[in-house]
C-alpha cells in the first residue's frame, strides 16, 4: 500500500506522478525529475524532493526560492545527484564542472573545487537545530504544552519517532527544536531527521509537500502558533572542511 489506491495519489509527496502500473495493478508513484519509485507511506528523501523541485517548470512552480537570510544552507537551491536509494551523493557538481562535498542533508561542507575533488563518504548530519520565531501573541505559550504539541507534530505528521526529538526550548518568541539521530540509532524504516526537518521547513513556509492533507495548522491549547522566520543549523558527525579564507 505505497499509495492511495482509490484515486492513485501519493499522500506524502505531491511532486510525483502516479499510475496503477505496480504489481497486481497497484498504484505506484514516481518522483518528478528522477523517476524514482517512492514509498508513499513515509516521507520522500530531501534529495529526490529537491530534484523534483528543480525539474518543475519555472512558471508552474508553486514554490519560492528561500530568502537568503532564512537558511544557514547559504547555497540555496541546486539540482542534486541522488543515489538509487534517494540519498544525496557525497559529491555534487554543477553544469560548469564546479564540485563540492555535501552532508546527508545536501548542505555543502567543503570549499568548491573542480572535477578532481574527492568526497570519500557521505557524512551524516546527526544533530539539527531548528530555530523559529513565532508571531506575537497575547501571552507566551506554556512551555510544556508547546513541547508536547511539537513532539506530537513530528511523530504524527512527519512520522519521526519521539526519541529523535532531543529537546524543545522556548524563550518567547524563539522556539528551538533539537533533532538528534546518530547512524547507530537509525533503524531501517526510521524517518531521517534531515527529511523531517525539510518537510517541516516547507510546511512553515506554507509550501506543504503533502498531497490532499491540509497545510500545517499548529495550535497550542487552541491558540495558533504562526511562524514568521526559520533558521536551520546542521551539525555533522565529522566537522566540515572549509579553508580559513572562508571563515574570515
Amino acid at each position: 500500500h505505497t499509495a492511495a489506491q482509490d484515486n492513485c495519489t501519493c499522500p506524502t509527496n505531491k511532486m510525483t506522478v502516479c499510475s496503477p502500473d505496480g504489481p497486481g495493478g497497484r498504484c505506484q508513484c514516481r518522483a518528478l525529475g528522477s523517476g524514482v519509485a517512492v514509498d508513499c507511506s513515509t516521507l520522500t528523501s530531501k534529495c529526490l524532493l529537491l530534484k523534483a523541485r528543480m525539474s518543475a517548470p519555472k512558471n508552474a512552480r508553486t514554490l519560492v526560492r528561500p530568502n537568503e537570510h532564512a537558511l544557514v544552507d547559504n547555497d540555496g537551491l541546486y539540482d542534486p545527484d541522488c543515489d538509487p536509494e534517494g540519498r544525496f551523493k557525497a559529491r555534487q557538481c554543477n553544469q560548469t564542472s564546479v564540485c563540492w562535498c555535501v552532508n546527508s542533508v545536501g548542505v555543502r561542507r567543503t570549499d568548491k573545487g573542480d572535477l578532481s575533488l574527492r568526497c570519500d563518504e557521505l557524512v551524516r548530519t546527526h544533530h539539527i537545530l531548528i530555530d523559529l520565531r513565532h508571531r506575537p501573541t497575547a501571552s507566551a505559550f506554556n512551555h510544556s504544552d508547546l513541547d508536547a504539541e511539537l513532539r506530537r507534530l513530528f511523530r504524527e505528521r512527519y512520522r519521526l519517532h519521539p526519541k529523535f526529538v532531543a529537546a524543545v526550548h522556548y524563550e518567547q518568541p524563539t522556539i528551538q527544536i533539537e533533532l538528534r539521530q546518530n547512524t547507530s540509532q537509525k533503524a531501517a524504516g526510521d524517518v531521517d531527521i534531515g527529511d523531517a526537518a525539510y518537510y517541516f521547513e516547507r510546511d512553515v513556509k506554507g509550501e506543504s509537500l503533502f498531497q490532499g492533507r491540509g497545510g500545517l495548522d499548529l495550535r497550542v491549547r487552541g491558540e495558533p502558533l504562526q511562524v514568521e522566520r526559520t533558521l536551520i543549523y546542521y551539525l555533522d558527525e565529522i566537522p566540515p572542511k572549509f579553508s580559513m579564507k572562508r571563515l574570515t
Epitope: H1, E156, K163, V165
Partner: antibody
Framework: QSLEESGGDLVQPGASLTLTCKAA????????MLWVRQAPGKGLEWIGC???????TYYASWAKGRFTISKTSSTTVTLQMTSLTAADTATYFC?????????????WGPGTLVTVSS | YDMTQTPASVSEPVGGTVTIKCQAS??????LAWYQQKPGQPPKLLIY???DLASGVPSRFKGSGSGTEYTLTISGLQCADAATYYC????????????FGGGTEVVVK
C-alpha cells in the same frame, strides 16, 4: 518482554488512586506507554499516553485534569486518578506501542481492577 | 477522529466468513489496527496499517480499506475465533475521545 499493572482497589466515590505499570525485558525509552480502560461488559476506552523520551503526556478529552500519567523510574509508569466516581469502575490496562510512530499496541499488561463504590 | 464499528454482534457457523466494518470520522491514512479480545484477557494485536498481519496471526484474518472505511474479514471461522474485535486508529492522539471502535462480538455456532 512483559507489562504488569498493580494498585487496583475498591475505593469510595471522590477518592484518589494511583496505578503502577511495571515493564520488564525492554527499554522504555524506545516506546510510548498508553493506558486503556474497560468497564465491565463494555468496550475499550483510551485514557492517555506518555512519550517516554521527552516525557510529554496526552489525554483523551474526557480524561484531562483528572488523570495524570508519569514515568516514575526507568521501568515504571503510573496513572494517577482523582475524584473517582462509579463510572470509573473498570479494568485498567497499560500497554506499549510497537515502536513505530503509529499508536499500535502490541504489548499489554493483564489489567488491574478498580471498583468505585460506597 | 471517532471510530464507528459495525455490527455490534455477529453469529456465524464454523467454516463461515465474518465481515466487520470500521468507519473513521476523518481520513486516517490507513493507520488502523484490529485487536482480538477474549474474556478475562487483554486485547491482542491482529492487524496494523490496515492490512498487515501481526506476528503469528493466521492468514484467515484479512484487513483492507483506506481513507475512512476499513474492513476486517475472518474466513474459515474456527471456534477459537469467538471473541470481541476492536478497531483502533493509530493516526493521532490529539483532541480525541477514544481511539477505539465500540467492538464487535463474534459468536461461532
Amino acid at each position: 518482554q512483559s507489562l504488569e499493572e498493580s494498585g487496583g482497589d475498591l475505593v469510595q466515590p471522590g477518592a484518589s488512586l494511583t496505578l503502577t505499570c511495571k515493564a520488564a525485558g525492554f527499554d522504555l525509552n524506545n516506546y510510548s506507554m498508553l493506558w486503556v480502560r474497560q468497564a465491565p461488559g463494555k468496550g475499550l476506552e483510551w485514557i492517555g499516553c506518555i512519550y517516554i523520551s521527552g516525557g510529554t503526556t496526552y489525554y483523551a478529552s474526557w480524561a484531562k485534569g483528572r488523570f495524570t500519567i508519569s514515568k516514575t523510574s526507568s521501568t515504571t509508569v503510573t496513572l494517577q486518578m482523582t475524584s473517582l466516581t462509579a463510572a470509573d469502575t473498570a479494568t485498567y490496562f497499560c500497554a506499549r506501542d510497537d515502536g513505530s510512530t503509529s499508536y499500535y499496541l502490541n504489548l499489554w499488561g493483564p489489567g488491574t481492577l478498580v471498583t468505585v463504590s460506597s | 477522529y471517532d471510530m464507528t464499528q459495525t455490527p455490534a454482534s455477529v453469529s456465524e457457523p464454523v467454516g463461515g466468513t465474518v465481515t466487520i466494518k470500521c468507519q473513521a470520522s476523518e481520513d486516517i491514512y490507513r493507520l488502523l489496527a484490529w485487536y482480538q479480545q477474549k474474556p478475562g484477557q487483554p486485547p491482542k494485536l491482529l492487524i496494523y496499517d490496515a492490512s498487515d498481519l501481526a506476528s503469528g496471526v493466521p492468514s484467515r484474518f484479512k484487513g483492507s480499506g483506506s481513507g475512512t472505511e476499513y474492513t476486517l474479514t475472518i474466513s474459515g471461522l474456527q471456534c477459537a475465533d469467538a471473541a470481541t474485535y476492536y478497531c483502533q486508529q493509530g493516526y493521532t492522539i490529539g483532541n480525541i475521545d477514544n481511539s477505539f471502535g465500540g467492538g464487535t462480538e463474534v459468536v461461532v455456532k
